[in-house]
Interface confidence: low
């Protein structure tokens, strides 16, 4: 494979903790300024597997606020607007990276953490288990 | 609001770049070891708004591999297994944090970046615009 040469302008990495501990610039390069999912689209309401968005806040985490989707129904909404239990509303989950303050309450020291969040819901055909 | 006292064991923060630059431990605390979304569930295939998962790789980003969902159809799959264009398959998007190597190719210096990824698809009732 291609080896990319190390940039000579990199910060010094001779710290005894390297490469576990790295420097991170928190000035976020943000390509999307709309962080409230309720404003970004109304899919959560128009979906055949609609969901509610719950605010999850944790001051020891960055980002401190994460929105979690909870499916409104076990079934899906059919053409008549009724819940059809022959289909299932299920959460679509995504693994995301967050920063966890470590040691706790430190303003400038973090540890990477992977958490699983539900982003929205989709309508699926149920798996039917036939009893022999 | 409540002011949490600073932990006396925090690293020194008298760097001229503070608080923009912080120390991050890359030893991930991972509550979920399954990072391939195709293995985590087969919803992408069973959904009425099925999607394909595309591998997006960037060695200058951490994580370097991100899976992007692309809806297979404009419409949704109906009970007969056909695409119904009276409904729309739409991507559910999520803003996630990634680390971008900065300066480029540096092994131990990053900048936080927010990117929008499509996690999966859901079936929605279209917004119908009636022409006057």
């Amino acid at each position: 494979g291609i080896t990319i040469p190390r940039n000579p302008g990199c910060p010094n990495s001779e710290d005894k903790n390297f490469p576990r501990t790295v420097m991170v610039n928190l000035n976020i390069h943000n390509r999307n300024t709309n962080t409230n999912p309720k404003r970004s689209s109304d899919y959560y309401n128009r979906s055949t597997s609609p969901w509610n968005l719950h605010r999850n806040e944790d001051p020891e985490r960055y980002p401190s606020v994460i929105w979690e989707a909870k499916c409104r129904h076990l079934g899906c909404i059919n053409a008549d607007g009724n819940v059809d239990y022959h289909m299932n509303s299920v959460p679509i989950q995504q693994e995301i990276l967050v920063l966890r303050r470590e040691p706790p309450h430190c303003p400038n020291s973090f540890r990477l953490e992977k958490i699983l969040v539900s982003v929205g819901c989709t309508c699926v055909t149920p798996i039917v288990h036939h009893v022999a | 609001g409540i002011t949490i006292p600073r932990n006396p064991g925090c690293p020194n923060s008298e760097d001229k770049n503070f608080p923009r630059t912080v120390m991050v431990n890359l030893n991930i605390h991972n509550r979920n070891t399954n990072t391939n979304p195709k293995r985590s569930s087969d919803y992408y295939n069973r959904s009425t708004s099925p999607w394909n998962l595309h591998r997006n790789e960037d060695p200058e980003r951490y994580p370097s591999v991100i899976w992007e969902a692309k809806c297979r159809h404009l419409g949704c799959i109906n009970a007969d297994g056909n695409v119904d264009y009276h409904m729309n398959s739409v991507p559910i998007q999520q803003e996630i944090l990634v680390l971008r190597r900065e300066p480029p190719h540096c092994p131990n210096s990053f900048r936080l970046e927010k990117i929008l990824v499509s996690v999966g698809c859901t079936c929605v009732t279209p917004i119908v615009h009636h022409v006057a």
Partner: antibody, heavy 118, light 110 residues
Framework: EVQLLESGGGLVQPGGSLRLSCAAS????????MSWVRQAPGKGLEWVSA????????YYADSVKGRFTISRDNSKNTLYLQMNSLRAEDTAVYYC???????????WGQGTMVTVSS | NFMLTQPHSVSESPGKTVTISCTRS????????VQWYQQRPGSAPTIVIF?????PSGVPDRFSGSIDSSSNSASLTISRLKTEDEADYYC?????????FGGGTKLTVL
Amino acid sequence: EVQLLESGGGLVQPGGSLRLSCAASGFTFSSYAMSWVRQAPGKGLEWVSAISGSGGSTYYADSVKGRFTISRDNSKNTLYLQMNSLRAEDTAVYYCARDLIWGVAGSWGQGTMVTVSS
Amino acid sequence: NFMLTQPHSVSESPGKTVTISCTRSSGSLANYYVQWYQQRPGSAPTIVIFANNQRPSGVPDRFSGSIDSSSNSASLTISRLKTEDEADYYCQSYNHKDIVFGGGTKLTVL
């Protein structure tokens, strides 16, 4: 009725800059990804750039990467294309288009002409 | 990146049927939708087929689209040709980061 009206075209010297705008009406602008497509005189269509409904994701053709920037202001129902370091080969009619989904331009504006010449 | 190849021109008489082909150079055509756009002289393009074979409302059923996975190609068929069908036709497809148009086919209705 979906309406897309491009503006901002004109004559510019090589190396110069221009900002195109596309005013949208007749639909919920923030719900749709948008694209710019261009057509050089007597030539075929060439995709230039695309942006997601929220503005969070942007995509560019290799031929314009690093020189052009697509953006949108959903509060003004307006799509933009900032074009820097313009070259003679950027001369074309620039169309803005509303995407049905990624890669499907459902509705088009009438276009605005950009001429890069000394 | 991939390319979409179309014939430069085709011609046919009114009332007849004409087919325009579009071949994808790399990557499975079946994995991504193919669209067809009509562009009359001096006008902006309009979509006549999306999602391989779907017609937007207002497009006559004389227009149809299909794909052939074995040859990695798509086709636009126009039956019962009319003089107003004379135009340039562009196929278009995409992958996860690029949108590509074919070079265009000039249809002449004799």
